[in-house]
C-alpha cells in the first residue's frame, strides 16, 4: 500500500554528479516523523535499502553514504518513508534523483561559437565536441541544478559535436559539458574545461534557467 503519507525529499551531497571513486551521501528527509526510509534504485534488479530515520528539530532523515562511487551504483533513486515496521505502509515516492558517475572517459571540448564574450541580446550557441564517439552531450551551468542535453552528431573533421543554442544573451555564467554513450546514460565523461561566458552591457552574472530541464534533481536543501 503506497501513498499513505506525503512524499519525502531526496538529495545528494555534495551533488548528483559524482566523480568515479569519490563519495556521495544520499539523504532522505521529511517533516513527517518517519521511522524508516526505503531508498530504491530503479532498474531490472530490486535494489532497495531500508534506513532508520533519525529525528531532529521536527525533521526525520536518513543518510546513505556511498564511500566510493562506481558505475554499478549510478542510476535513478527514489525515497519512501514508513511510519510503522510494516513494509506495506509507505509514503508516496520522493521525486526521482539521477545519480550520475562522471570522469570515466576523455573530456570533450567546449567553445562559444561567437567567442566567450558576447554583447547583450546576441544569440549564444555553445558547442561541445570530441573525437570520442559520444552519443549525447550534457551542458551544465554553475549554480543550476539541471543540465541541458543534446544528441551528438558526426562532423566531417572526425569529431562528434552538439550545438547548444542558449538564445539571446542576457547574463553570463560558467559552463561545462560532458559526453555519454546511449547504452550507459548515467556514466559520463570527464568535464570539459570550464567556459566562462561574459555578457557585456549587463552587470549581473547569472544566466536564466532553462525552461525545460532535461534531467531531474532533488530539492536543493542543505544537509543537516
Amino acid at each position: 500500500h503506497e501513498g499513505v503519507h506525503r512524499k519525502p525529499s531526496l538529495l545528494a551531497h555534495p551533488g548528483r554528479l559524482v566523480k568515479s571513486e569519490e563519495t556521495v551521501i544520499l539523504q532522505c528527509w521529511s517533516d513527517v516523523m518517519f521511522e524508516h526510509f526505503l531508498l530504491h534504485r530503479e532498474g531490472m534488479f530490486n535494489d532497495t535499502l531500508r534506513l532508520i530515520g533519525e529525528h531532529h528539530d521536527g525533521v526525520s532523515k536518513a543518510n546513505f553514504s556511498i564511500s566510493r562511487m562506481t558505475q554499478d551504483l549510478a542510476g535513478t533513486y527514489r525515497c519512501y518513508g514508513s511510519v510503522t515496521h510494516s513494509p506495506y505502509q509507505v509514503s508516496a515516492p520522493s521525486d526521482p534523483l539521477d545519480i550520475v558517475i562522471i570522469g570515466l572517459y576523455e573530456k570533450p571540448s567546449l567553445s562559444a561559437q561567437l567567442g566567450p564574450t558576447v554583447l547583450a541580446g546576441e544569440n549564444v550557441t555553445l558547442s561541445c565536441s570530441s573525437r570520442s564517439s559520444y552519443d549525447m552531450y550534457h551542458l551544465s551551468r554553475e549554480g543550476e541544478a539541471h543540465e541541458r542535453r543534446l544528441p551528438a552528431g558526426p562532423k566531417v573533421n572526425g569529431t562528434f559535436q552538439a550545438d547548444f543554442p542558449l538564445g539571446p544573451a542576457t547574463h553570463g555564467g560558467t559552463y561545462r559539458c560532458f559526453g555519454s554513450f546511449h547504452d550507459s546514460p548515467y556514466e559520463w565523461s570527464k568535464s570539459s574545461d570550464p567556459l566562462l561566458v561574459s555578457v557585456t552591457g549587463n552587470p549581473s552574472n547569472s544566466w536564466p534557467s532553462p525552461t525545460e530541464p532535461s534531467s531531474k534533481t532533488g530539492n536543493p536543501r542543505h544537509l543537516h
Epitope: E21, R41, M44, N46, D47, L49, S67, R68, D72, D183
Partner: antibody, heavy 116, light 108 residues
Framework: QVQLVQSGAEVKKPGSSVKVSCKAS????????ISWVRQAPGQGLEWMGG????????NYAQKFQGRVTITADESTSTAYMELSSLRSEDTAVYYC?????????WGQGTLVTVSS | EIVLTQSPGTLSLSPGEGATLSCRAS???????LAWYQQKPGQAPRLLIY???RRATGIPDRFSGSGSGTDFTLTISRLEPEDFAVYYC?????????FGGGTKVEIK
C-alpha cells in the same frame, strides 16, 4: 588491478550443498556488483544471480530461485554462492564475475562435481 | 527471458581471414545492452565488446561489434592465431541476464 580469487574444487554428494567463495582485491568491493555464472562441461554460460554488497540484497535467475543464496562480507571483500539440493546436472565450473551487466573481471573458476 | 541464438555453431577459418559471428535475440535488447566474450579452453571468459559496439580495455581494434534491436554481429577483421576460441554473446538489458550458445572459431 582487480583480482577475483575463488575457492578450490569441490566434490559433493547429490542432495548436499556447496558454498563457493570469491575474494576480491584491487577495487572497491562494496560498490561493485558481483555475479555468479556457471558453465557445465562442454556447455555454454549461465547467469545465476548477483549482489551489490553495499545494498546487501541479492537477485537471482528464476531457474535457481530457492536453491541458490548469494551473500557478501564487506569486511573481508568476499562474495559467496551457496547452492543446495545438488544434483548431477549441477556439475559445472562456477565463476564469480564483477558487475550485474557485462562482466569485465572474472574469477578463475571453481569446479564443483556432484557424484554419488 | 531473452533467448540469444548464435550462428554459425562452428566457423573454420585460416589465420589472416576475416570472421563474422552473428547473435540474434528472441526480443529486442534494450539500449544495445549486448556484450561479446572470448573463451579459451580451461580459462574464464574475457570481455571483448559491451554496449554492442564499445571495445573493452586492451582489446585490439581488429575486434568490432555492431547491431541493435535483435541482430548483432561480432567481426574479427584479420584472424590472429590467438583468436581461435569460442565466442559468446550476452544480453544485459533485462533479467535474467542470458548468454548465447557460443560460436567456435577453429583453424581450418
Amino acid at each position: 588491478q582487480v583480482q577475483l580469487v575463488q575457492s578450490g574444487a569441490e566434490v559433493k554428494k547429490p542432495g548436499s550443498s556447496v558454498k563457493v567463495s570469491c575474494k576480491a582485491s584491487g577495487g572497491t568491493f562494496s560498490s561493485y556488483a558481483i555475479s555468479w555464472v556457471r558453465q557445465a562441461p562442454g556447455q555454454g554460460l549461465e547467469w545465476m544471480g548477483g549482489i551489490i554488497p553495499i545494498f546487501g540484497t541479492a537477485n537471482y535467475a528464476q531457474k535457481f530461485q530457492g536453491r541458490v543464496t548469494i551473500t557478501a562480507d564487506e569486511s573481508t571483500s568476499t562474495a559467496y554462492m551457496e547452492l543446495s539440493s545438488l544434483r548431477s546436472e549441477d556439475t559445472a565450473v562456477y565463476y564469480c564475475a564483477r558487475s550485474r551487466s557485462y562482466f569485465d573481471y572474472w574469477g578463475q573458476g571453481t569446479l564443483v562435481t556432484v557424484s554419488s | 527471458e531473452i533467448v540469444l541464438t548464435q550462428s554459425p555453431g562452428t566457423l573454420s577459418l585460416s589465420p589472416g581471414e576475416g570472421a563474422t559471428l552473428s547473435c540474434r535475440a528472441s526480443q529486442s535488447v534494450t539500449s544495445s545492452h549486448l556484450a561479446w566474450y572470448q573463451q579459451k579452453p580451461g580459462q574464464a571468459p574475457r570481455l571483448l565488446i559491451y554496449g554492442a559496439s564499445r571495445r573493452a580495455t586492451g582489446i585490439p581494434d581488429r575486434f568490432s561489434g555492431s547491431g541493435s534491436g535483435t541482430d548483432f554481429t561480432l567481426t574479427i577483421s584479420r584472424l590472429e592465431p590467438e583468436d581461435f576460441a569460442v565466442y559468446y554473446c550476452q544480453q544485459y538489458g533485462s533479467s535474467p541476464l542470458t548468454f548465447g550458445g557460443g560460436t567456435k572459431v577453429e583453424i581450418k
